[in-house]
Amino acid sequence: LQEKIEEIAAKYKHLVVKKCCYDGVRINHDETCEQRAARISVGPRCVKAFTECCVVASQLRANNSHKDLQLGR
C-alpha cells in the first residue's frame, strides 16, 4: 500500500496537493471517499489527489483483506 501511494504522490509536486493525497489514505470506515472529498475547499487539485489516493488505498485494503480471508480458509 505504502509503495503504491508513494508512487501516486510522487506525481504531485505541490506539497499541499501531495498532502491531500496522503489525507485520502487515512482509514475512515464511516464515509466513502466521495463523501470525504466533498468537504475539501482548497481546490479541485486537492479533491482529485485525495480521491485518487483514497480510492486506490481502499481497493488495496479490500484486496488484502480478501486474500487474508482466502488464506484463512
Epitope: 509536486k13 505541490h14 506539497l15 499541499v16 498532502k19 475547499s41 482548497v42 481546490g43 479541485p44 486537492c46
Partner: antibody, heavy 118, light 111 residues
Framework: QVQLVQSGAEVKKPGSSVKVSCKAS????????IHWMRQAPGQGLEWMGY????????NYNENFKGRVTITADKSTSTAYMELSSLRSEDTAVYYC???????????WGQGTTVTVSS | DIVLTQSPASLAVSPGQRATITCKAS??????????MNWYQQKPGQPPKLLIY???NLDSGVPARFSGSGSGTDFTLTINPVEAEDTANYYC?????????FGGGTKVEIK
C-alpha cells in the same frame, strides 16, 4: 470583499528578526493557502513560502535556509511571516497573497517595506 | 525548480500598437491538459495584479485587450491595442509545483 491587510513598515538592524502580519477578511480564512513573496528595490518577485491555515501545512523556498517561518492564527484570520538573521540584502517589500484553487494568486496584500540597516 | 525566462526585458510600444511578451519554462507546466501558468501586472508602488490565469483565462475586470496563449513550456501575453495606462511591469508565474517561481519581469513603456 476579500482583503489582505499587512502590518506597517519596519526598520531593522542586521542580525535581528522581523515579523510581518497579513490579516484576511471577506472570505473563510481556512479555505485558501496564503503565500509570501518579496521584492527587492528595482527587482523582480521572489517566492518565500506558504501556509495552508486549515491544516497548518507549510512549505518554504530553500534559498532562505531555514531563516523564514510562516504561521497562521485561525482565531484572528491572520498569517505571519518571520524572517531571522536579517542582512542588508533582505531590504525589500514583502507581500502576502491568497492562492485560489491551488492555481493562482487572486488577492494580494498592499505590501510591507522592511529596511535592514545598521 | 522550474525556471521561467521572460523576454524581452523591456519594450516601448506606441499607443494602439501590439505588445507581445513571452515566457519560456525550463520544463512543462502542463498537467493533464491544464497549464499552470499565470500573468500579473505591477504598477509602481502597487502589489501585482492578476491578469491571466491557466495560460489563457482573463481574470474578471481585466480589459479584453489583454490575452494569453501557449501551452507546455512556451507562453505569450499580448496587449492589443496598448493604452497609456498599460505602462507597468509584467510577470509570468507557475503554480504547478513548489517552489512557485516567477519570470524576471518585462517593463512595458508607452512611447
Amino acid at each position: 470583499q476579500v482583503q489582505l491587510v499587512q502590518s506597517g513598515a519596519e526598520v531593522k538592524k542586521p542580525g535581528s528578526s522581523v515579523k510581518v502580519s497579513c490579516k484576511a477578511s471577506g472570505y473563510t480564512f481556512t479555505d485558501h493557502i496564503i503565500h509570501w513573496m518579496r521584492q527587492a528595490p528595482g527587482q523582480g518577485l521572489e517566492w518565500m513560502g506558504y501556509i495552508y491555515p486549515r491544516e497548518g501545512w507549510t512549505n518554504y523556498n530553500e534559498n532562505f535556509k531555514g531563516r523564514v517561518t510562516i504561521t497562521a492564527d485561525k482565531s484572528t484570520s491572520t498569517a505571519y511571516m518571520e524572517l531571522s538573521s536579517l542582512r542588508s540584502e533582505d531590504t525589500a517589500v514583502y507581500y502576502c497573497a491568497r492562492e485560489r484553487n491551488l492555481e493562482y494568486f487572486d488577492y494580494w496584500g498592499q505590501g510591507t517595506t522592511v529596511t535592514v540597516s545598521s | 525548480d522550474i525556471v521561467l525566462t521572460q523576454s524581452p526585458a523591456s519594450l516601448a510600444v506606441s499607443p494602439g500598437q501590439r505588445a507581445t511578451i513571452t515566457c519560456k519554462a525550463s520544463q512543462s507546466v502542463d498537467y493533464e491538459g491544464f497549464n499552470y501558468m499565470n500573468w500579473y501586472q505591477q504598477k509602481p508602488g502597487q502589489p501585482p495584479k492578476l491578469l491571466i490565469y491557466a495560460a489563457s483565462n482573463l481574470d474578471s475586470g481585466v480589459p479584453a485587450r489583454f490575452s494569453g496563449s501557449g501551452s507546455g513550456t512556451d507562453f505569450t501575453l499580448t496587449i492589443n491595442p496598448v493604452e497609456a495606462e498599460d505602462t507597468a511591469n509584467y510577470y509570468c508565474q507557475q503554480s504547478l509545483e513548489d517552489p512557485h517561481t516567477f519570470g524576471g519581469g518585462t517593463k512595458v513603456e508607452i512611447k
